[in-house]
């Protein structure tokens, strides 16, 4: 069990003077009512800070913004309004920051009654910025090329979708009537548009269109559209089938020249799809149930985006504000997060280690009690608070953390008990991807990781009283150290550290607020004086991934490898550093069925590991067939798991099958579709239909 | 001291039966992966058999599969070989190792070994 | 099977040299690869476990690194006691394998 701050700890030396020394206060001079801060580039140390004031009058709205720079991860900020002649920028998408470390920012303002709009642009990490007028008004953030920081991309109030390819100096139009516009990869440009006048009545009537020359030509590359997303390599597209409401997904893996209809259930018009999580190997998707269930079911893809296999029932995602608790636990291969509404209408918490294949409750942490939700008190399981939670409005202040390059670690705040409670909840801690969790904090807190898992660092949630304490553990959470970085508590609003946890700043965003006054101010706090030396060899040891028997020598074996890490010794205080790179050597493990998906006309019998084919597909099943190239329609019965490397040991060999007797698909068909050059294309009509929240990569 | 003996070893013929043991002491016998590991004349080392603390693992060299049966016994602190169908080439000191009770651990006790000889 | 290669097969130093051996496996094995010495008539012993991790009781001079499919074991300044056969091991995959052994004399 993990000791609190009162047991003995090991204790950090002298931290409070070496955190003293290194505390930084700024007070910002405004009474603006928000507050948004920005990180620019990678380990450049810039922020910027919009702060906004917005007061209705009447019929319009009266705004004020204030624009702070800092280059030293927030300890001081400059004042840099002047530099956007005092221009009010709107707060909801106002800065939209360039990709990788090109040091580019888009700043939108707020003209109001305009027909037009405009923009501050900078190419040097904000340092100077260049006004520009638009012949448009936004209607969300402009949004970059991924692949050239050049090339943006924006769509206007009344629909009509613009290119810039030289950093917003010139501005031309692409299309009009355009419900939906993403960019793909080379930088291509996918788009719905309608020619009916209305994305909002109209669903289900779009074209799907394609660029991949910014507008000199377009192609039509899908109709009968209802939505689309993109999600690692795939395209993907709900179609209407014909049959009245319903729709199905359709995919592409070529850019929209090919399409294949996917193995899975078609939907009416009050369900939905959504990409939970999408990689270059597979897709999760989710199916909502027919009715107002408020759930549904998981499924995962093969290889092709095509087939798919049931993975998880009963999967929670609320129809209503579209709420999903699915979680990608990032700091391990194969481990994702997602709770399911049980047949008794509790919410319970479920984790599946080997991406999708087998989900679990949580284990229980060893330092907890069952709380009174449990039906027997020595069995329960932990349940992670998530989207949901926060939702349905209890006290957690965030959603689970983890990091790619903090190996193992995980932290969320949940309850322990047959189901989520709806009690306080505490901060628990993995350090081996969810495996096993220890109870680190009482009550909720904000939390954030440092230094690629060296520090942690959190401040408990507390709305009817100042705070001006920070807790921090410099192992993983085992025990936790006490400053006080203010005499006077302040109203807390947040903690910010730079994206990618390779920091060892922290800031805490709060303000203070008397009859006459209120005003912003950080705090922000360098570690480095805590973790004083780098570490060395000697700090690291190696450490399994996804070990559950250390006697079996197929211990570990996740997709058919496994993988030693070096990780930090709890024990070692020292710098991993901003160069750290995850240490990691995998090892390939030997096949056996576990490693296998069925192809499509094959299924798996319950409690058995091999695939039979289905004794016929008829009926509605015609819908699930592959389209497209030949090879869609050979199969050996079994299908690698997307992403899996096993070798030797098992290895399944069906004879060939022709399913071509068996099934038809009939989706717009590449000679069907048709292209034209630039000249402005016809239609009408808007609607932002699918959106990005909680790395949700695509909700219809 | 922890220590691992092994005895059992002998001449006997092409075709004959064996049956190693190794007697465990100094640790807990029941908590770890124990291993028969062989060296013929002049040879380098080559695994044989290896089973987990519970016998729920049992792995063996292709060179032994339905030959040779690994055992053990917690109560009484030992480790078996029983050697079935022996052949010339098994001919070898039969070494008994703990391994470590780590993921993929070293072999980090080894006994003095028994010599097996296999002639006719 | 992963096959592991080690080199030298021989070896002849005079004392306090430095004495490098080499193993190769046929695959990546991880940090899974454990270094044994063997001295006439006696048992294996382990010094290194886990590519670089020093057993406990041999002497520093023993040391391992190399991760993957590349392993050195290298003895710092040769001891006339360190006169053995040392033997490389991986412990990844079944079934387990040795290396063919490296004799080190001492001229």
């Known amino acids: 069990s993990a000791p609190g701050e009162d047991e003995e700890c090991g204790r950090v030396r002298d931290f409070v003077a070496k955190l003293a020394n290194n505390t930084h206060q700024h007070i910002f001079n405004d009474l603006s009512g928000s507050v948004s801060l920005s990180w620019v580039g990678d380990s450049t140390g810039v922020i910027l800070v919009l702060t906004t004031f917005q007061v209705p009058i009447f019929m319009i709205t009266i705004g004020q913004s204030k624009l702070y720079r800092s280059e030293d991860y927030g300890k001081n900020f400059k004042d840099i309004t002047d530099l956007i002649n005092n221009t009010f920028i709107r707060s909801d998408f106002g800065i939209a920051i360039g990709p990788e470390n090109s040091g580019k920012v888009v700043l939108t303002a707020d003209v109001s009654g305009s027909h037009g709009s405009r923009i501050f642009r900078s190419s040097d990490f904000a340092k100077n910025f260049v006004q520009q007028e638009l012949p448009f008004v936004p209607l969300m953030q402009i949004m970059y090329s991924p692949q050239n920081s050049d090339y943006l991309l924006a769509l206007s109030n009344k629909n009509e979708l613009w290119v810039s390819k030289n950093f917003g100096g010139k501005w031309e139009k692409l299309y009009d009537t355009v419900c939906l516009a993403k960019w793909g990869s080379d930088n291509t440009i996918f788009f719905t548009a309608n020619h009916n006048g209305s994305c909002s009545n109209d669903r289900g009537m779009l074209e799907l269109w394609r660029t991949s020359d910014l507008g000199k030509s377009f192609k039509t590359i899908g109709s009968k559209i209802y939505s689309f997303g993109l999600g690692g390599r795939f395209l993907f597209a709900s179609v209407m089938t014909g049959k009245g409401t319903l729709r199905a997904i359709h995919v592409s893996t070529d850019q929209g020249d090919t399409w294949s209809m996917a193995q899975l259930p078609p939907v009416g018009h009050e369900q939905f799809y959504s990409i939970l999580a999408a990689n270059d190997d597979m897709v999760f998707m989710h199916v909502d149930e027919p009715g107002d269930s408020g759930f549904g079911t998981i499924f995962t893809s093969d290889d092709r985006g095509i087939v798919y296999s049931k993975s998880l029932e009963r999967h929670l995602y609320t129809t209503t504000g579209g709420e999903t608790d699915f979680t990608n636990v990032t700091s391990l291969r194969g481990v994702y997060i997602t709770s399911i509404l049980a047949e008794d209408k509790s919410v319970q918490s479920m984790i599946t280690f080997d991406q999708g294949g087998r989900w679990t409750h949580l284990r229980k942490p060893e330092n907890s009690k069952c709380d009174a939700t449990a039906r027997d008190p020595e069995k329960c399981s932990l349940h992670i608070h998530a989207a949901y939670s926060i939702a349905t409005g209890l006290n957690v202040p965030m959603l689970p953390l983890s990091e790619p390059n903090a190996v193992g670690i995980v932290i969320a705040h949940g309850s322990v008990g047959d189901a989520i409670s709806v009690m306080r909840p505490d901060v628990y801690i993995s350090d081996d991807g969810g495996y096993s969790w220890t109870k680190a904090l009482e009550g909720p807190h904000h939390y954030t990781i440092l230094d690629s898992g060296g520090i942690i660092v959190a401040v408990e949630q507390n709305a009817h009283q100042g705070v001006n304490q920070i807790k921090f553990s410099t192992d993983e959470g085992q025990c936790w150290q006490t400053y006080n970085f203010t005499k006077d508590p302040i109203f807390f609003t947040g903690l910010a550290s730079e994206p990618g946890a390779r920091s060892m700043n922290i800031s805490i965003w709060g303000y203070r607020s008397s009859l006459f006054h209120q005003y912003w101010i950080s705090y922000t706090i360098d570690f480095k004086d805590i973790l004083e030396r780098n570490c060395e060899e000697k700090d690291y040891t190696i450490w399994l991934a996804h070990s559950t028997d250390p006697e079996d020598y197929e211990d570990g074996c996740i997709l058919g490898y496994k993988e030693q890490f070096l990780r930090l010794r709890k024990s070692s205080v020292c710098q991993n550093g901003r160069d750290y790179v995850v240490t990691k050597q995998p090892s390939i493990c030997l096949c056996s069925l576990e490693d296998f998906l069925c192809d499509f006309g094959y299924y798996r019998p319950e409690n058995d590991s091999k695939c039979v084919e289905q004794p016929e597909l008829k009926g509605h099943d015609l819908e699930f067939c592959l389209y497209g190239r030949e090879e869609h329609l050979t199969t050996n019965g079994y299908r690698k798991i997307p992403g899996d490397k096993c070798q030797g040991g098992v290895n399944p060999v069906r004879e060939v099958k022709d399913l071509k007797k068996k099934c038809t698909s009939n989706f717009l068909s590449p000679e069907k579709q048709n292209s034209k050059s630039n000249g402005s294309a016809g239609g009408s009509g808007g609607l932002n239909d699918i959106f990005e929240a909680q790395k949700i990569e695509w909700h219809e | 001291e922890v220590q691992l003996v092994e005895s059992g070893g002998g001449l006997v013929k092409p075709g004959g039966s064996l049956r190693l043991s190794c007697a465990a002491s100094?640790?807990?016998?029941?908590?770890?992966?124990m291993n028969w590991v062989r060296q013929a004349p002049g040879k380098g080392l080559e695994w044989v058999s290896s089973?987990?603390?519970?016998?729920?693992?049992?792995y063996y060299a292709d060179s032994v599969k339905g030959r040779f049966t690994i055992s053990r016994d917690n109560a009484k602190n030992s480790l078996y070989l029983q050697m079935n169908s022996l052949r010339a080439e098994d001919t070898a000191v039969y070494y008994c190792?703990?391994?470590?009770?780590?993921?993929?651990?070293?072999?980090?006790?080894w006994g003095q070994g028994t010599m097996v000889t296999v002639s006719s | 099977e992963i096959v592991l290669t080690q080199s030298p097969d021989f070896q002849s130093v005079t004392p306090k040299e430095k004495v490098t051996i080499t193993c190769r496996a046929s695959?990546?094995?991880?940090?899974?690869l454990h270094w044994y010495q063997q001295k006439p008539d006696q048992s294996p012993k382990l010094l290194i476990k886990?590519?670089?991790q020093s057993f406990s009781g041999v002497p520093s001079r023993f040391s391992g690194s190399g991760s993957g499919t590349d392993f050195t074991l290298t003895i710092n300044s040769l001891e006339a006691e360190d006169a053995a056969a040392y033997y490389c091991h991986q412990s990844s995959s079944l079934p387990l394998t040795f290396g063919g052994g490296t004799k080190v004399e001492i001229k």
């Open positions: 190792a703990r391994r470590g009770s780590g993921s993929y651990d070293a072999f980090d006790i």
């Open positions: 886990y590519a670089s």
């Open positions: 100094g640790f807990t016998f029941s908590s770890y992966s």
């Open positions: 089973i987990s603390s519970s016998s729920s693992y049992i």
């Open positions: 695959q990546s094995i991880g940090y899974s």
